[in-house]
């Protein structure tokens, strides 16, 4: 028996280890809290709806609630959707929450609330009120929060949610919150650090405010603090893609030299965009446990050359000094202080946006003996010259990031072709600098309405490449030619990213010769000329090759394209050649005894497989181990009859999505004895097979969403016992008969998607209505989006809630 009604328009899941019952009603267009929420619900999410009020009745009988997420039901107008503006703020009636004696977490962000709600239960440990209209914090409003541990009050007064008054915090407002661990007042136009703060704090977020000066005793009692974020006070406004007001005379955030003396447990200090010109070592006198220091977006280019403060950070693991360039200055090279050599625990060093012309080996000498260094990020520096062999000193590094520079083919600084001594205005690089939306985002930790937790931390490198090991990222540079000497001494590299360069040479199998250990090569967004079938053959250990978006030469007629280069890559597992507009090939077949995945999206198989031309029907046949083939977006309005005979024998997954297919030879699936997943979504199919089981005995997943299917054949799923996943959503299906959906097949399904169709809810639908009400098969969006288009009285009604009692009477009569 089901323990909640199918009419509940929410996803219900059990977290058995935590003993949680989770009801998620995110973005269900609700205007009231739905009925039928199980009484044992522990976690209730109602974010992104239009519920206008909360009253004691709202959570009546939901006594086990531990967490309520009621965010974004009336988002402040400047922050919210312009086509669905909320003009009446959320009303919270007295005692709405007071009966919820187990409630620990309450999220009320984005509801235009004017005050901290009263009548909250003493069990509450987390209260989140971000993006409301609360800009006065008074002691009396916090008296009920005796057990609160986490308090989010940010984004209540800033450029995207203006309050037009100065944000006020009563003295000692937070002092009686004796269990408070995390306090966020970010994005609030706060002008001073609130005093006195409870000594229990472990995290304090004061970033993006209008604090111009820290007072000597602001943090005096915070001896348990582990994270302090003061970023964006006295911001560096150059190139800021948001309204930005620096402090008077562009002065830095003033921090007394002993301001941090009490913070003996501090692990993370963020001073991003504070217009700092100096970093006094005295700040760190007592902070010897500091692990992460963010000093990006300041004016520290000179300080980086002295950096005496680094001698006082023995435990530092992450250091970010990015975008500290002096305006209008293009330095000849990078000057790193010898003090960097003292950072024995350092794992991640980021110095983007220092802006210099030539990277020389001795520039990095202070880093040579840092045994724990894993990531060196020198992206977005407009480096023109770099002898890559210098990185032989950095074999232990996992990532060397030189992306978004102007590195061009090897040559020393005397080669006028690749450098110029003129002082270049950094302003001319503005669009590229703006592209980088990690350092130039107003609030990189902001939460969206959809997710409660802050966004993931910044990872600049392609994760799938990084997992193979040592990575050199040269993407988005000006490389137009590669030769083996460029990679001398880099045999330790496992991953090389050359994406987004200007390489247009005909590779012959010699260019990457030193890279004996390379497993992953990203060559996407270049201008590959596949004249030689020996291209890439020197990469004996290459497992993944991405040559997507290399369409330049494929778009020109009469050019040789040797697609059979794959036969020389003996361990290649995955090949991506998407968006290449491939419409011709000199070699008729691709060959490989190792390749398992081929992505061939965005090409022109419609031309290669043109009616009457059988030459390329076996293009993929000799990819003997191929299991996954994606040939979506190939403009295939039909498939010639020989296509399936020419498919590799071990194929498991085949995607033909977004092709404009008008018909499909279902019977031909018999050729694919191992096929498990077939994706035919986003086509123009109007029919399904007479009997799927006659076409394939192996198919487990069939995706037919976004087609033009109007009806299902009488015996569509008869004997299709292996099927586990069927997606028929976003079609034009009007009726489903019992014979099309035999129960002995349906009961094996893990997932059936039927939403966004055009069901006719006449008496002919009685069986279907009965079945969706009784089946245990998961049907997503059943309560909200599996609806009737007619007849009149039932238009827009959910199939699940149909009352076809009169039809049943007719049947019994």
């Amino acid at each position: 028996a089901r323990w909640f009604p199918k009419t509940l328009p929410c996803d219900v899941t059990l977290d058995v280890p935590k003993n949680h019952v989770i009801v998620d009603c995110t973005d269900k267009h609700l205007t009231e809290i739905p009925g039928g929420i199980p009484t044992n619900t522990t976690n209730l999410t109602l974010t992104i709806n239009h519920i206008p009020d909360i009253s004691p009745a709202s959570f009546h009988r939901l006594d086990h609630l531990v967490e309520i997420d009621f965010r974004c039901n009336c988002v402040p107008i400047p922050l919210g959707s312009k086509n669905n503006m909320c003009i009446k703020r959320l009303q919270i009636k007295p005692r709405s929450f007071s009966g919820l004696t187990y409630l620990k977490s309450l999220y009320l962000d984005g509801n235009q609330l004017l005050e901290i709600p009263q009548g909250l239960p003493p069990s509450l440990q987390l209260l989140s009120l971000e993006a409301n209209n609360i800009f006065s914090i008074r002691k009396e409003n916090l008296t009920e929060l005796a057990n609160i541990e986490i308090l989010y009050l940010g984004q209540n007064c800033y450029y995207r949610n203006p309050c037009y008054v100065s944000y006020s915090i009563e003295k000692d407002a937070f002092l009686n919150l004796t269990k408070l661990k995390v306090l966020s007042l970010k994005d609030n136009n706060v002008t001073a650090v609130p005093t006195v703060l409870p000594s229990t704090l472990t995290e304090l977020y004061l970033y993006n405010n209008m604090i111009a000066k820290i007072q000597e005793d602001d943090f005096n009692n915070l001896n348990q603090l582990q994270i302090l974020d003061l970023s964006g006070n006295c911001p560096r406004c150059y190139n800021a893609p948001f309204p930005c007001a620096p402090c008077k005379n562009n002065s830095p955030l003033q921090i007394p030299v002993n301001a941090f003396d009490a913070l003996t447990e501090l692990k993370v200090l963020r001073l991003h965009s504070n217009s700092l010109q100096h970093v006094p070592p005295r700040w760190f006198k007592n902070i010897n446990k500091l692990q992460e220091l963010d000093l990006s977006q300041n004016f520290l280019a000179k300080e980086i050359g002295d950096a005496k403060f680094l001698h006082f950070l023995p435990s530092l693991i992450q250091l970010d000094l990015s975008f500290n360039f002096e305006l209008q200055v293009y330095r000849a090279s990078m000057n790193l202080s010898q003090a960097f050599s003292s950072l024995k625990s350092l794992k991640i060093l980021r110095i983007r946006g220092y802006v210099f012309k030539e990277l020389k080996s001795f520039n990095l000498s202070p880093l040579h003996n840092l045994q724990n260094l894993e990531v060196l990020d020198l992206g977005t520096n407009f480096i023109k010259i770099a002898n890559l062999s210098m990185f032989k000193q950095f074999k232990r590094l996992k990532v060397i990031d030189l992306s978004v520079n102007k590195i061009s083919p090897s040559g020393d600084s005397s080669e006028v072709g690749f450098c110029s001594n003129a002082r270049t205005s950094v302003e001319s690089y503005e669009p590229q600098v703006l592209e980088q939306l990690h350092y130039f985002r107003y609030d990189k930790y902001a939460r969206s309405c959809r997710f409660k937790n802050k966004e993931a931390s910044f990872m600049s490198v392609n994760e799938s490449c990084y997992k193979y090991g040592q990575t050199l990222d040269l993407s988005k540079n000006s490389i137009f030619f590669v030769k083996s000497s460029d990679f001398q001494h880099l045999s330790f590299l496992k991953c090389l990213n050359l994406s987004g360069n200007l390489i247009s040479q005909t590779l012959n199998g010699s260019e990457f010769q030193p890279l004996a250990e390379l497993r992953y090569l990203d060559f996407s967004n270049n201008r590959l000329d596949l004249l030689h079938s020996t291209a890439f053959e020197e990469l004996h250990k290459l497992e993944v090759l991405d040559i997507s978006s290399n369409s330049h030469y494929f778009q020109s007629e009469g050019i040789t394209h040797m697609l059979n280069f794959t036969k020389n890559l003996k361990v290649l597992q995955k090949l991506m050649m998407n968006d290449n507009d491939i419409s011709s090939s000199t070699s008729r077949t691709m060959e490989s005894e190792s390749l398992r995945t081929l992505e061939f999206r965005g090409n022109h198989l419609d031309v290669l497989w043109r009616e009457g031309d059988n030459r390329y029907l076996q293009l993929f046949k000799n990819l003997l181990k191929l299991e996954e083939l994606d040939i979506s977006k190939n403009s295939l309005s039909f498939l010639p009859s020989g296509v399936f005979d020419g498919m590799p024998p071990n194929l498991k997954n085949l995607s033909l999505a977004k092709n404009g297919l008008k018909s499909f030879s279902w019977k031909k699936l018999q050729c694919l004895k191992n096929l498990e997943t077939l994706d035919l979504s986003h086509n123009q199919l109007t029919t399904v097979p007479e009997r799927l089981s006659n076409c394939s005995r192996s198919l487990k997943n069939l995706i037919l969403k976004n087609n033009q299917i109007r009806s299902l054949t009488k015996y569509f799923l008869q004997d299709a016992f292996q099927l586990r996943y069927l997606d028929l959503s976003s079609n034009k299906i009007q009726m489903i008969q019992k014979t099309s959906f035999p129960e002995n097949v349906l009961n094996n399904l893990k997932m059936l998607l039927l939403h966004h169709n055009r069901f006719l809810c006449t008496c002919d639908a009685v069986w279907f209505v009965w079945w969706v009400n009784h089946t245990e098969v998961t049907i997503p969006y059943l309560a909200t989006d599996v609806t009737c288009v007619g007849p009149g009285a039932h238009k827009g009604q959910s199939v699940i809630s149909l009352d076809l009692y009169t039809c049943e009477l007719d049947l019994t009569n």
Epitope: E216, P256, V257, N258, H278, P280, P281, K308, F312
Partner: antibody, heavy 121, light 107 residues
């Protein structure tokens, strides 16, 4: 040119307090730290404490409970106060300027001529 | 606190000779070391900071060297005005501490 000049009482009775003033010229107290150092007769130098340009203070931990350093930027004066003097506090007391930016640990590049303090009843 | 140990405690030398005074720190102080000269009845004067940088106006016969825990001050071709006491001091964080001093006398 940079100058520092100490002025003190000369003689202090045991258990009494010592107050010394350091008057500076040629630089601003908001931009530099000022140290206090003493030297007992015939002995070496001992650092007592300092006041930074922003007014923050640091003290020798052995003397912290008895010491207080403050300043008046407008008068270009730095004040040392030391409580509960004993005979072993007899020494020449110097003020000296810290060489560099506020909050940076530098050497002392300019010294006063010192003022002699004798603790005796 | 960091201890600074100076040696020798006293030293006799003649004009024109070269002498070396050493200073050892109880822990790594990188190059945060200063040397001072103090003549009888006068206040100390800065000679060297950051272990090897000569202060303004200091003759080139003085030179500082070392890093980490071992440091030295070398005086080439001693002049009559070089006799007096010499002190090392670390400036690697608070509290600053001085060495016990080296008294350089005329032989």
């Amino acid at each position: 040119q940079v100058q520092l000049k100490e002025s003190g009482p000369g003689l202090v009775a045991p258990s009494q307090s010592l107050s010394i003033t350091c008057t500076v010229s040629g630089f601003s107290l908001t931009g530099y730290g000022v140290n206090w150092v003493r030297q007992p007769p015939g002995k070496g130098l001992e650092w007592l404490g300092m006041i930074w340009g922003d007014g923050s203070t640091d003290y020798n931990s052995a003397l912290k409970s008895r010491l207080s350093i403050r300043k008046d930027n407008s008068k270009s004066q730095v004040f040392l106060k030391m409580n509960s003097l004993q005979t072993d506090d007899t020494a020449r007391y110097y003020c000296a300027r810290d060489k560099g930016y506020d909050g940076y640990y530098y050497a002392m590049d300019y010294w006063g001529q010192g003022t002699s303090v004798t603790v005796s009843s | 606190d960091i201890q600074m140990t100076q040696s020798p405690a006293s030293l006799s030398a003649s004009v024109g000779e070269t002498v070396t005074i050493t200073c050892r720190a109880s822990e790594n102080i990188y190059s945060y070391l200063a040397w001072y000269q103090q003549k009888q009845g006068k206040s100390p004067q800065l000679l060297v900071y950051d272990a090897k940088t000569l202060a303004e106006g200091v003759p080139s016969r003085f030179s500082g060297s070392g890093s980490g825990t071992q440091f030295s001050l070398k005086i080439n071709s001693l002049q009559p005005e070089d006799f007096g006491s010499y002190y090392c001091q670390h400036h690697y964080g608070i509290p600053y501490t001085f060495g016990g001093g080296t008294k350089l006398e005329i032989k």
